[in-house]
């Protein structure tokens, strides 16, 4: 069950790499975000809050990532044509409830100008 | 962060197929269980409770599965040697809190006697 295409610019290119933006509602305090390439888990990040509001960030599959109050950005480097694929942000919301799982995504097109090391 | 090998018999062979058993504590009411082959999501099942305690079972990646009050079984059929791999049960517990993610697994060995269609 795929909830749909991202309703925002999901891919931001810079310096032969790409930032993949996975948004979540900023009211959400505890969640898991997975980046899927096709059906494969590339990256994931889990944010939980313990007693005393201590925040814990964990990754089962680590990628360079950046967390804000309404998004997780995953960074892929050294782009080549094999990176072209469907990418999905798989969000599991845990707190505040209700528990909700959403999958949104888009196709990453790789053009010559975005490749890491273009042939001169 | 892999929590470890399954401390139970994870693979049950029958009729050229395999039942992969993914256990969860029977106190758990809402969860997501993914079956991973290596780093790839093969199957997943999410159990949530809606208003009026209605139970909802959803799959982003559907496999033949069976849900009990403390396990999810995923069934793979027509086994061949390419099925040999590490398989992981990736459990995300949502209710009751605290939110927790555990990954347990083991290696699926494929022996001649377990293949679907042995050469006579």
């Amino acid at each position: 069950e795929i909830n749909g295409s991202a309703n925002y610019e999901m891919f931001i290119f810079h310096n032969g790499g790409v930032q993949i933006l996975c948004k979540y509602p900023d009211i959400v305090q505890q969640f898991k975000m997975q980046l899927l390439k096709g059906g494969q888990i590339l990256c994931d990040l889990t944010k939980t809050k313990g007693s005393g509001n201590t925040v814990s960030i964990k990754s089962l599959k680590f990628c360079h990532s950046q967390l804000s109050n309404n998004s997780v950005s995953f960074f892929l480097y050294n782009l080549d044509r094999s990176h072209a694929n469907y990418y999905f942000c798989n969000l599991s919301i845990f707190d505040p409830p209700p528990f909700k799982v959403t999958l949104t995504g888009g196709y990453l097109h790789i053009y010559e100008s975005q490749l890491c090391c273009q042939l001169k | 962060e892999i929590n470890g090998s399954a401390n139970y018999e994870m693979f049950i062979f029958h009729n050229g197929g395999v039942q992969i058993l993914c256990k969860y504590p029977d106190i758990v009411q809402q969860f997501k269980m993914q079956l991973l082959k290596g780093g790839q999501i093969l199957c997943d099942l999410t159990k949530t409770k809606g208003s009026g305690n209605t139970v909802s079972i959803k799959s982003l990646k559907f496999c033949h599965s069976q849900l009990s009050n403390n396990s999810v079984s995923f069934f793979l059929y027509n086994l061949d040697r390419s099925h040999a791999n590490y398989y992981f049960c990736n459990l995300s517990i949502f209710d009751p809190p605290p939110f927790k993610v555990t990954l347990t697994g083991g290696y699926l060995h494929i022996y001649e006697s377990q293949l679907c269609c042995q050469l006579k």
């Epitope: 509602p25 707190d95 505040p96 | 809402q30 809606g50 208003s51 209710d95």
Partner: antibody, heavy 121, light 106 residues
Framework: QVQLVQSGAEVKKPGSSVKVSCKAS????????MHWVRQAPGQGLEWMGL????????NYNQKFQGRVTITADKSTSTAYMELSSLRSEDTAVYYC??????????????WGQGTTVTVSS | EIVLTQSPATLSLSPGERATLSCSAS?????MHWYQQKPGQAPRLLIY???KLASGIPARFSGSGSGTDYTLTISSLEPEDFAVYYC?????????FGQGTKLEIK
């Protein structure tokens, strides 16, 4: 069916406190968070804050920070909103609203009937 | 704080006519929700996630928009549609409502 039933109207003196209740039925109380929203006479709606019932985490609108306290009693499936140091401009209808999510955002899917609080000397 | 400005403040139309209500955000938001409120009643969810129809809401209601500009459309007004309509954004803290558009019978 899913219902949120709020306590009755209150008349309060400036400087005092008021505690409004919201009793949930028709669903598992801990499976959803609860928001509070208010509406002053002839005015628009204003989000005050929420409580995540099972974790007790709260999130308040900074405008009310320090004056509002949202709590919940799981045993009676009741959420509470207490507002202290009342002034005349706190005269409003106070609503509880249940949290829900779409694919992208969150919203209030079920509302209480409202509780009128009048602050007057 | 993200300010939501609804226009017009009052809209006078007859049953059967088409109503278009606007909501403009002071900065970009990811989605908009719409609520209907009748006198003496609590608000009722109409549209969530910009364009999704809430449970039990008739198909004559629709929502659209992105960024800072969002619209609620009622294709053919029924007598029970005359009420106050509020837009709401939950993508930027503190979460805010528009001041409302009153839809009245001409």
């Amino acid at each position: 069916q899913v219902q949120l039933v709020q306590s009755g109207a209150e008349v309060k003196k400036p400087g005092s406190s008021v505690k409004v209740s919201c009793k949930a039925s028709g669903y598992t109380f801990t499976d959803y968070a609860m928001h509070w929203v208010r509406q002053a006479p002839g005015q628009g709606l204003e989000w005050m804050g929420l409580i995540s019932i099972y974790s007790d985490h709260t999130n308040y609108n900074q405008k009310f920070q320090g004056r509002v306290t949202i709590t919940a009693d799981k045993s009676t499936s009741t959420a509470y909103m207490e507002l202290s140091s009342l002034r005349s401009e706190d005269t409003a209808v106070y609503y509880c609203g249940r949290n829900n999510y779409g694919n992208y955002g969150w919203y209030f899917d079920v509302w209480g009937q409202g509780t009128t609080v009048t602050v007057s000397s | 704080e993200i300010v939501l400005t609804q226009s017009p403040a009052t809209l006078s139309l007859s049953p059967g006519e088409r109503a278009t209500l606007s909501c403009s955000a002071s900065s970009s938001v990811s989605y908009m929700h719409w609520y209907q409120q009748k006198p003496g009643q609590a608000p009722r969810l109409l549209i969530y996630d910009t364009s999704k129809l809430a449970s039990g809401i008739p198909a004559r209601f629709s929502g659209s928009g992105s960024g800072t500009d969002y619209t609620l459309t009622i294709s053919s007004l029924e007598p029970e549609d005359f009420a106050v309509y509020y837009c709401f954004q939950g993508s930027g803290y503190p979460y805010t409502f528009g001041q409302g558009t009153k839809l009245e019978i001409k």
